[in-house]
C-alpha cells in the first residue's frame, strides 16, 4: 500500500510541479524595471521570456514580443532552451508514469516493466526539476551581474544640465513559481525513484534438490513450493519421474513481494 | 545609441504660435513616455507635458494649461508640442525627455535631446 500511496503522490506533486514551470514559461513577469526618479509620468515595466510589458498609471497595458533572435543575450536563450527542456522533459514523464502506476492495470503489464518505467519517469522528473531551477537560478543571476541597477548620467550641452537616472531591476513573480515547480517536480520524481525501489521484483524461489529412491520411485520435492502468497502458477508439488538428483528451474516466476497489495 | 533631435524652436513674437517636433532614433524596443521640460535663463528645469506613448496619457504644467497640446506618432517614434498664446514668461530652452526600452531584450533608461530655444519677443 505504501508503495501505491508513494508513486500516486509522486505523480501528483510532479504533475503540479510541470503545470507550474509551463506557467512560469509562460509568465510576463520575470523581471520589473523601476526608475527611481522617472522624471515623465508613472510607467511600470515587466519582462518576461518572450516579451516586454508596460503598464501605465491609467490602467493601459501593452506587450511586444522579442521578434530578433541575434539581439538577445545569450543568456535569456539558455534560459528559454532549459525551460523549454524541463517542460518537455516533464511532459514524457508524465506520459510514461500514467502508465506506471500501480493502481491501472494495462493488460499483463509485469511488476518489473511498471517498475521501470516508475523509474524513468522519476529520472525525468528530477531532470525536469533541475531544468526548471537552473534557467530560473540563471536568469536571477543575470539580473543581478548585468541589469542589478543601472545607473545614467543625463549630460545636455546647452544648459549644462545633469540628470542621474537609476533603473531598478527586481525580481518577478515567475522567477518564484518557477523555483517552486522546479523543486515540487524534483521531489515528484524523488519520491518516484523511492516507489520503484519497492515495485522491483525480488528473487524469492528456493532452489530444492530432488534426490530419486531404488526401482520406479517417485521423487516428491517439499522445497517445491513457491515462497509467495500461492497465487503464482507454481504453486503445486511438482513430481520429477526421470529419476535423478536435480535442481528445479523449470517455470521459474519472479512474485513481487508485495503481491498482497 | 538613441539620439532625440529636436527641432521648430525659434523667435515668435508674444501670442504667436510654435510647433515643436522631437524625433526619436537608434536601437528603440518601445517608448514608453516622452515629454518636454524647459530652463529659464538663470532658473531651473520645469516640467511642460508629458505624455504615455501606449494609452496618450496627458500631464500638464499649470501654467500651460489650455495653451500647450502635446501629441505623439508612434509610428515615426516622434513627439510634437502645439505651443499657442506664447507669453514672455514662456522663453527658455525646450528640452525633449524619453524613457524608453532599448536593446533586443530591452534595457529601460531615460534619454534628454540637446534642447532648442524659444524665445517669445516682441
Known amino acids: 500500500m505504501a508503495v501505491t500511496a508513494c508513486q500516486g503522490l509522486g505523480f501528483v506533486v510532479s504533475l503540479i510541479g510541470i503545470a507550474g514551470i509551463i506557467a512560469a514559461t509562460c509568465m510576463d513577469q520575470w523581471s520589473t524595471q523601476d526608475l527611481y526618479n522617472n522624471p515623465v509620468t508613472a510607467v511600470f515595466n515587466y519582462q518576461g521570456l518572450w516579451r516586454s510589458c508596460v503598464r501605465e498609471s491609467s490602467g493601459f497595458t501593452e506587450c511586444r514580443g522579442y521578434f530578433t533572435l541575434l539581439g538577445l543575450p545569450a543568456m535569456l536563450q539558455a534560459v528559454r532552451a532549459l525551460m523549454i527542456v524541463g517542460i518537455v522533459l516533464g511532459a514524457i514523464g508524465l506520459l510514461v508514469s500514467i502508465f506506471a502506476l500501480k493502481c491501472i492495470r494495462i493488460g499483463s503489464m509485469e511488476d518489473s516493466a511498471k517498475a521501470n518505467m516508475t523509474l524513468t519517469s522519476g529520472i525525468m522528473f528530477i531532470v525536469s526539476g533541475l531544468c526548471a531551477i537552473a534557467g530560473v537560478s540563471v536568469f536571477a543571476n543575470m539580473l543581478v551581474t548585468n541589469f542589478w541597477m543601472s545607473t545614467a548620467n543625463m549630460y545636455t550641452g546647452m544648459g549644462g544640465m545633469v540628470q542621474t537616472v537609476q533603473t531598478r531591476y527586481t525580481f518577478g513573480a515567475a522567477l518564484f513559481v518557477g523555483w517552486v515547480a522546479g523543486g515540487l517536480t524534483l521531489i515528484g520524481g524523488v519520491m518516484m525513484c523511492i516507489a520503484c525501489r519497492g515495485l522491483a521484483p525480488e528473487e524469492t524461489n528456493y532452489k530444492a534438490v530432488s534426490y530419486h529412491a531404488s526401482g520406479h520411485s517417485v521423487a516428491y520435492k517439499p522445497g517445491g513450493f513457491k515462497a509467495s502468497t500461492g497465487f503464482g502458477s507454481n504453486t503445486k508439488n511438482k513430481k520429477i519421474y526421470d529419476g535423478g538428483a536435480r535442481t528445479e528451474d523449470e517455470v521459474q516466476s519472479y512474485p513481487s513481494k508485495h503481491d498482497y497489495v | 545609441q538613441v539620439q532625440l533631435v529636436e527641432s521648430g524652436g525659434g523667435l515668435v513674437q508674444p501670442g504667436g504660435s510654435l510647433r515643436l517636433s522631437c524625433a526619436a532614433s537608434?536601437?528603440?524596443?518601445?517608448?514608453?513616455?516622452m515629454g518636454w521640460y524647459r530652463q529659464a535663463p538663470g532658473k531651473g528645469l520645469e516640467l511642460v507635458a508629458a505624455i504615455t506613448f501606449g494609452g496618450g496619457s496627458t500631464n500638464y504644467a499649470d501654467s500651460v494649461k489650455g495653451r500647450f497640446t502635446i501629441s505623439r506618432d508612434n509610428s515615426k517614434n516622434t513627439l510634437y508640442l502645439q505651443m499657442n498664446s506664447l507669453r514672455a514668461e514662456d522663453t527658455a530652452v525646450y528640452y525633449c525627455?524619453?524613457?524608453?526600452?532599448?536593446?533586443?531584450?530591452?534595457?529601460?533608461?531615460?534619454?534628454w535631446g540637446q534642447g532648442t530655444l524659444v524665445t517669445v519677443s516682441s
Open positions: 537608434g536601437s528603440i524596443f518601445s517608448i514608453n513616455a
Open positions: 525627455n524619453a524613457d524608453l526600452l532599448v536593446g533586443g531584450f530591452p534595457r529601460r533608461n531615460v534619454y
